[in-house]
């Protein structure tokens, strides 16, 4: 058992059929010695008494808030939340495998630049009774300092007959150089409550691996005299990092006829302009990347040609 | 995905080709490192990531663009020099790019270069002969060193009697690239920056 | 009508052990949480430890110590055993559905003596 919060505690059960469970002592907190009595919940039924109680937690009947009473006054609450161990592993029902990059992905995180902000985020099927918080530092064994929000909900989505929901926070480092070679990853730690399940996600990653640039802004078309050809153009987006000579990115240019079918030309350039050949009914666009380390594409940004 | 191939201008500062050329080779290196050592824990989850420079070196804090110097989470250990030498800052004058940052990066290429020629040696004795050095990568290492034309003692190459355990070696050898991408990273951003100054 | 019959008291030495039954009808025994309780001659109703519907244990204290209860749901039947016996455990003990004692047996009369 460890405390999560004050007065909230986490029991850790190895979680099979007939599991004897953990021995947990309770203590009111009162200088109070006699006449103290134990409920749980909203129940009303006495289950103990005595300063300090002895229960045995085997399952989410077990948990719960347990009061502490003498003549009809509270004297203290103690929450107990249960973290479940099935076969070794640590459950993962309350937040959604997104399965991308890979299996076993419950966090995905974002940064727009090299200043030491990024956006985490995670999903959910559950709409009720939900909690989250979230705490990051940079290397684990002499952490440095990373600042996260709150968890908000993001978005919703229906996905067949299930309702999704998106969470994300934000988090910044507090003292991040954008130039720095990271050499120990971000470590970002979610703690999740639904109802008296707790569970706990983690997620390790360098800046550098998830930066994914804003797309280019001010996209825009120059048509050539006497030609099919035009003069795109674009800017680097806002929230890139500067001196943008430093921190350089690269580009790809997609000329894209209406139908998906169409063979799309694309041409890489580390200029921010760029000759294309104009369809009828096509649309160009641009996206970014950095230019020295292949993280991610940012989305599209898109122009018609006509 | 292959970075785009520059063709410098004639008047354009020499050691950017040259810093290009030695991030596409250090990364193509690790990516066939990281296919033919699947077995082995080659990728960025599994290595530990050491810098063989570290307190050798101080190429990020001198090499700073004069933008980040006002950051003062960049400015650690800035040792801050403003005198220029060098071939690559030909006869372009900046208060940005020092001496020391050119030297420094010198430096990191050489302690790189013994590193790996050190090791392609115990690999080359290895019977399995799963993974040698890319000499293109050894090459363009040897072509940036010229480019810069810093004059410093030779360091000899490190000579093992032991014999070599080739599993470590191996993954040293991952380690050793995951490190030199990054730093390569850095040095292709401050000659894109000194191009642009 | 609720009805609940203690059973397996009895003199034994000190270090000994007893295990007490109770037998239950008259109400939904599995879904019950139940207590056990004991009165020493010239004292009030003391608390020994509470079994809920899943056999989930309460004891006072910070552990168990000699008394572990459990029940037998097919049974309708809950149980205490008690072990390392000394001279003050000597006392009237009651199987009760409440802490307080107001629905409970008649009780079963252990007495620790050598």
């Known amino acids: 058992i460890w405390e999560l919060k004050k007065d909230v505690y986490v029991v850790e059960l190895d979680w099979y059929p007939d599991a004897p469970g953990e021995m947990v002592v309770l203590t009111c907190d009162t200088p109070e010695e006699d006449g103290i009595t134990w409920t749980l919940d909203q129940s009303s039924e006495v289950l103990g008494s005595g300063k300090t109680l002895t229960i045995q937690v085997k399952e989410f009947g077990d948990a719960g808030q347990y009061t502490c009473h003498k003549g009809g006054e509270v004297l203290s609450h103690s929450l107990l939340l249960l973290h479940k161990k099935e076969d070794g592993i640590w459950s993962t029902d309350i937040l959604k495998d997104q399965k991308e990059p890979k299996n076993k992905t419950f966090l995905r995180c974002e940064a727009k630049n090299y200043s030491g902000r990024f956006t985490c985020w995670w999903l959910t099927t559950i709409s009720t009774d939900l909690t989250f918080s979230v705490k990051s530092s940079r290397g684990s064994s002499d952490p440095q300092g990373v600042t996260c929000g709150a968890a908000t909900l993001s978005a919703e989505r229906v996905r067949g007959d299930n309702k999704e929901y998106e969470y994300s926070v934000e988090c910044q480092e507090d003292s991040a150089c954008p130039a720095a070679e990271e050499s120990l990853p971000i470590e970002v730690m979610v703690d999740a409550v639904h109802k008296l399940k707790y569970e706990n996600y983690t997620s390790s990653f360098f800046i550098r691996d998830i930066i994914k640039p804003d797309p280019p802004k001010n996209l825009q078309l120059k048509p050539l005299k006497n030609s099919r050809q035009v003069e795109v153009s674009w800017e680097y987006p806002d929230t890139w990092s500067t001196p943008h000579s430093y921190f350089s990115l690269t580009f790809c240019v997609q000329v894209q006829g209406k139908s998906k079918r169409e063979k799309k030309d694309r041409v890489f350039t580390d200029k921010t302009s760029a000759t294309v050949i104009c369809r009828k009914n096509a649309s160009i666009s641009v996206r970014a990347q950095d230019r020295y380390y292949s993280s991610s594409w940012s989305e599209w940004a898109s122009v018609p040609c006509s | 995905r292959n970075l785009p191939v520059a063709t410098p201008d004639p008047g354009m500062f020499p050691c950017l080709h040259h810093s290009q050329n030695l991030l596409r080779a250090v990364s193509n290196m690790l990516q066939k490192a990281r296919q033919t050592l699947e077995f082995y824990p080659c990728t960025s989850e599994e290595i530990d990531h050491e810098d063989i420079t570290k307190d050798k070196t101080s190429t990020v804090e001198a090499c700073l663009p004069l933008e980040l110097t006002k950051n003062e989470s960049c400015l650690n250990s800035r040792e801050t020099s403003f005198i220029t030498n060098g071939s690559c800052l030909a006869s372009r004058k900046t208060s940005f790019m020092m001496a020391l940052c050119l030297s420094s990066i010198y430096e990191d290429l050489k302690m790189y270069q013994v590193e790996f020629k050190t090791m392609n040696a115990k690999l080359l004795m290895d019977p399995k002969r799963q993974i040698f050095l890319d000499q293109n990568m050894l090459a363009v290492i040897d072509e940036l060193m010229q480019a810069l034309n810093f004059n410093s003692e030779t360091v000899p190459q490190k000579s093992s009697l032991e014999e070599p355990d080739f599993y470590k070696t191996k993954i040293k050898l991952c380690i050793l690239l995951h490190a030199f991408r990054i730093r390569a990273v850095t040095i292709d951003r401050v000659m894109s920056y000194l191009n642009a100054s | 009508e609720v009805q609940l019959v203690e059973s397996g008291g009895g003199l034994v030495q000190p270090g000994g052990s007893l295990r007490l039954s109770c037998a239950a009808s008259?109400?939904?025994?599995?879904?019950?949480?139940m207590f056990w309780l004991r009165q020493a001659p010239g004292k009030g109703l003391e608390w020994l430890s509470t079994i809920k519907p899943t056999g989930s244990t309460i004891y006072p204290g910070s552990g168990k110590g000699r008394f572990t209860i459990s029940r037998d749901n097919a049974k309708n039947t809950l149980y205490l055993q008690i072990n390392n016996l000394k001279p003050e455990d000597t006392a009237l003990y009651y199987c009760a559905r409440d802490i307080g004692g107001t629905v409970r047996g008649q009780g079963t009369q252990v007495t620790v003596s050598s």
């Open positions: 008259g109400f939904t025994f599995s879904s019950s949480v």
